[in-house]
């Protein structure tokens, strides 16, 4: 088992989270754009990206990964084989998803999201000249990266990448692909070494991790599911958190349980951690709610607000737990505890 240290991750501003959410929506929207619009949007993204690069956190490991991805993307853009490209893009998509769970500032997440969307868009462009143009833009972007803080470390990385880039340009196509795969392997290793504050496919927000279920359970079973993984059916502590969660729920158009009920005493709403519902939170009830029609004792996200409903109904749910601040121990390749009395023979 991996040791879990109480969260020491500083809270981010709601404005940054709004930017991050908007970018996620933007990424989804790009799939619907025509080629011409897509290209225009790529140029806009590049402009924003250049500006954002100047604000990168001074975390050399993250910067290194960011730069490797930039170089990798440029190299991938030059490859001719469609099937190979698809495989590489799948690999990078996984990496992007993994990197997206890192606890660094929203600005970093924003940059990674832009890169993901940008790369997806570049991969769909048919014209070689357009790709060449974008490649040049990315080259200029890389030059900007060289001017980032932590000069000595950054310069060292930048020089190494410049050398690699030059080497890639001189290689035949097959060797180029080989180098990209090696680069991917190193990149995966780098991602693995970084601290991940949230479990797989959980969402990080302001020092907490959230599991948005894709299946449905009644309210009590939802509590049990969360407890099993050391989490809690979500207890909302701030307006920012409420806005974040409401957005998640309304965007997916789902009725979603939260950890709030008046099961103990009719009309007295209480969170599952025992805390009362503060008066300032009552504004989040939908108009006319809670109405207790037919023993409705459990609260859900419904549309743009809250509703009370029957606790035995199956709905989606959200678990919440503090993000981890990990001191990573050396991991073994496999570290199993058998479900059966004895492990399989080694």
């Amino acid at each position: 088992q991996v040791s879990k240290v109480p969260s020491s991750i500083s809270q981010e501003q709601s404005r940054q989270d709004a930017i991050y959410q908007n970018l996620t929506q933007l990424k989804a929207a790009v799939g619907e754009l025509s080629e011409k619009s897509k290209l225009q949007e790529i140029y806009q993204e590049l402009t924003q990206l250049k500006a954002a690069v100047g604000e990168l956190p001074e975390k050399s490991k993250l910067q290194e990964i960011y730069q490797e991805l930039t170089r990798l993307k440029a190299a991938v853009g030059e490859l001719p084989e469609k099937s190979k490209l698809q495989e590489i893009y799948q690999e990078l998509t996984w990496l992007k998803a993994a990197v997206g769970e890192l606890p660094e500032k929203s600005k970093m997440q924003e940059i990674y999201q832009e890169l993901t969307r940008l790369k997806a868009a570049v991969g769909e462009l048919p014209e070689k000249s357009k790709q060449q143009e974008i490649y040049q833009e990315l080259t200029r972007l890389k030059a900007a990266v060289g001017e980032l803080p932590e000069k000595s470390k950054q310069q060292e990385i930048y020089q190494e990448l410049t050398r690699l880039k030059a080497a890639v340009g001189e290689l035949p196509e097959k060797s180029k692909q080989q180098e990209i795969y090696q680069e991917l392997t190193q990149l995966k290793a780098a991602v693995e070494r970084l601290c991940h504050p949230c479990p797989w496919e959980w969402t990080f927000f302001q020092g907490n991790c959230y599991f948005m279920s894709n299946s449905q359970r009644n309210w009590h079973d939802s509590i049990t599911a969360c407890k099993e993984v050391g989490a809690q059916l979500v207890v909302i502590k701030s307006a920012e958190e409420q806005n974040f969660l409401q957005l998640q729920s309304s965007r997916s158009n789902r009725f979603t349980w939260m950890g709030l009920s008046d099961l103990n005493q009719e009309g007295t709403w209480q969170w599952v951690d025992g805390s009362p519902l503060l008066p300032s939170f009552k504004q989040y009830w939908n108009r006319g709610e809670p109405n207790n029609v037919g023993e409705e004792d459990c609260a859900e996200f419904s549309g743009n607000g809250w509703n009370d409903d029957k606790c035995n109904l199956a709905k989606f749910w959200i678990c919440k737990k503090s993000a981890a601040s990990c001191s990573r121990d050396e991991e073994q390749f496999l570290s199993p505890a058998p479900a059966t009395p004895n492990p399989p023979p080694a």
């Epitope: 993994a98 769970e101 049990t224 099993e228």
Partner: nanobody, 121 residues
Framework: EVQLLESGGGLVQPGGSLRLSCAAS????????MGWVRQAPGKGLEWVSK????????YYADSVKGRFTISRDNSKNTLYLQMNSLRAEDTAVYYC??????????????WGQGTLVTVSS
């Protein structure tokens, strides 16, 4: 009590296909990463593939990439491994494994009793 029951193994010719299944119980399946581990005769354990709780993130060992596909059906508490273009070196006992919640890496904290896959002409 965590239980993982694999099925679908058997004898198949090189180039053939098999689909392994793993029925899970005793834990909230929908909240955990899951994966497959294999052990060839006389060899050590080899990690094969891993999938996130929602099935959005998948990860494969280089030796099976492009040939094997991991998937899950959370409504049935079942994990799958579709194995295509099978080779003699894929011969092994395949174990279904419950992933460690907090790890992105190839860690598993429970596994089943295994199902034997033999690739031979």
């Amino acid at each position: 009590e965590v239980q993982l029951l694999e099925s679908g193994g058997g004898l198949v010719q090189p180039g053939g296909s098999l689909r392994l299944s793993c029925a899970a119980s005793g834990f909230t399946f929908v909240m955990y990463p899951m994966g497959w581990v294999r052990q060839a005769p006389g060899k050590g354990l080899e990690w094969v593939s891993k999938i996130g709780p929602h099935g959005r993130l998948t990860y494969y060992a280089d030796s099976v990439k492009g040939r094997f596909t991991i998937s899950r059906d959370n409504s049935k508490n079942t994990l799958y491994l579709q194995m295509n273009s099978l080779r003699a070196e894929d011969t092994a006992v395949y174990y279904c494994a419950k992933g460690n919640l907090w790890e992105m890496s190839r860690r598993f904290d429970y596994w089943g009793q295994g199902t034997l896959v033999t690739v031979s002409s």
